[in-house]
């Protein structure tokens, strides 16, 4: 029961996490920027992974997509890649984990197969969460190192004068959504991995009793059939024959009047 609850909770937490990663990736508020001291209108700029938006004090908002790859920083491309990999892995993990859920019966799927699928999905969730956390952290670091405060430098060119606007870049809401979502996906993945241990049946070796045929030295051991999880050495359930007349406990069994041929 506890295993089913752990697996189910892990699935739900991961589902919420991956939804959050998708939301964060699509959001425009990865970095926000206040443009101060403009007498015409207060302008608020915010940028995402895919487009840049400007909102005026009147409420009017205009967004423009990044339709070029050349003018974008390599770090931004790396963040995009990390987030997309996180989403893809998470989506595959969700698909696998649906079939792995103990409460869902699909044909005659064994617990060992479900255990393997649960472990696989758990690892996928962990990697997905790490990708999201890494992506968001790389972006945050990029903001801190490169864009935190642009200096107000002036220079004159052919078209007159240009002055870099004194701006302050701050972390946008998407960063916090991404961090939390990545963490949830990671936690969900760990829970799935924990649930996997409970799903895997114990490898049971039944006590073997030797049956001796008179005049033969071959003992047939029924214990050769193991309850296999797929991880044991005797995965093909082969019958085990032993030349000696011994049990699996290495206790010598001698013929008696109760032996059957």
């Amino acid at each position: 029961m506890a295993v089913t609850a752990c697996q189910g909770l892990g699935f739900v937490v991961s589902l919420i996490g991956i939804a959050g990663i998708i939301a964060a990736t699509c959001m425009d508020q990865w970095s926000t920027q206040d443009l101060y001291n403009n007498p015409v209108t207060a302008v608020f700029n915010y940028q995402g992974l895919w487009r840049s938006c400007v909102r005026e004090s009147s409420g009017f908002t205009e967004c423009r997509g990044y339709f070029t790859l050349l003018g974008l920083p390599a770090m931004l491309q790396a963040v995009r890649a990390l987030m997309i990999v996180g989403i893809v892995l998470g989506a595959i993990g969700l698909l696998v984990s649906i079939f792995a859920l103990k409460c869902i019966r699909i044909g005659s799927m064994e617990d060992s197969a479900k255990a393997n699928m649960t472990l696989t999905s758990g690892i996928m969730f962990i990697v997905s969460g790490l990708c999201a956390i890494a992506g968001v952290s790389v972006f945050a670091n990029m903001l801190v190192t490169n864009f935190w405060m642009s200096t107000a430098n002036m220079y004159t060119g052919m078209g007159g004068m240009v002055q870099t606007v004194q701006t302050r870049y701050t972390f946008g809401a998407a960063l916090f959504v991404g961090w939390v979502a990545g963490g949830l996906t990671l936690i969900g993945g760990v829970m799935m991995c924990i649930a996997c241990r409970g799903l895997a049946p114990e490898e049971t070796n039944y006590k073997a009793v030797s049956y001796h045929a008179s005049g033969h030295s071959v003992a047939y051991k029924p214990g050769g059939f193991k309850a296999s999880t797929g991880f044991g050495s005797n995965t093909k359930n082969k019958k085990i024959y032993d030349g000696g007349a011994r049990t699996e406990d290495e206790v010598q069994s001698y013929p008696s009047k109760h032996d059957y041929v």
Partner: nanobody
């Protein structure tokens, strides 16, 4: 490199009209605000009128009702229609734009070289 080029200035009689235009050219990703400033001899530079992409406008009290600012977003151009001109309006008129050159980058406050407007009495 971004350039702002003003045109339309000249000598005009008091009560007359002029239409100034300013074109922003070069590598431009976004221009949220385009404005006109002026500097009269011996005075500080002052805002005449400004317009945002969304159509928000702001005028100096001295020109309200006489000047009209407009812009063509597709052409990255701003216009200043000046009617009922007075000798006090004599100044060098500068075009100013808040421009983002690259998709990912900071905004720059760009200025044109100015066009002279002289109103004779």
């Amino acid at each position: 490199e971004v350039q702002l080029v003003e045109s339309g200035g000249g000598l005009v009689q008091a009560g007359g009209s002029l239409r100034l235009s300013c074109v922003a050219s070069g590598s431009i990703f976004h221009i949220p605000i385009m404005s006109w400033y002026r500097r009269a001899p011996g005075k500080q530079r002052e805002l005449v009128a400004g317009i945002s992409t969304g159509g928000s406008t702001n005028y100096a009290d001295s020109v309200k009702g006489r000047f009209t600012i407009s812009r063509d977003n597709a052409k990255n151009t701003v216009y200043l229609q000046m009617n009922s001109l007075k000798p006090d309006d004599t100044a060098v008129y500068y075009c100013n734009s808040l421009i983002k050159e690259e998709a990912w980058g900071t905004f720059g406050d760009y200025w044109g070289q100015g066009t002279q407007v002289t109103v004779s009495s």
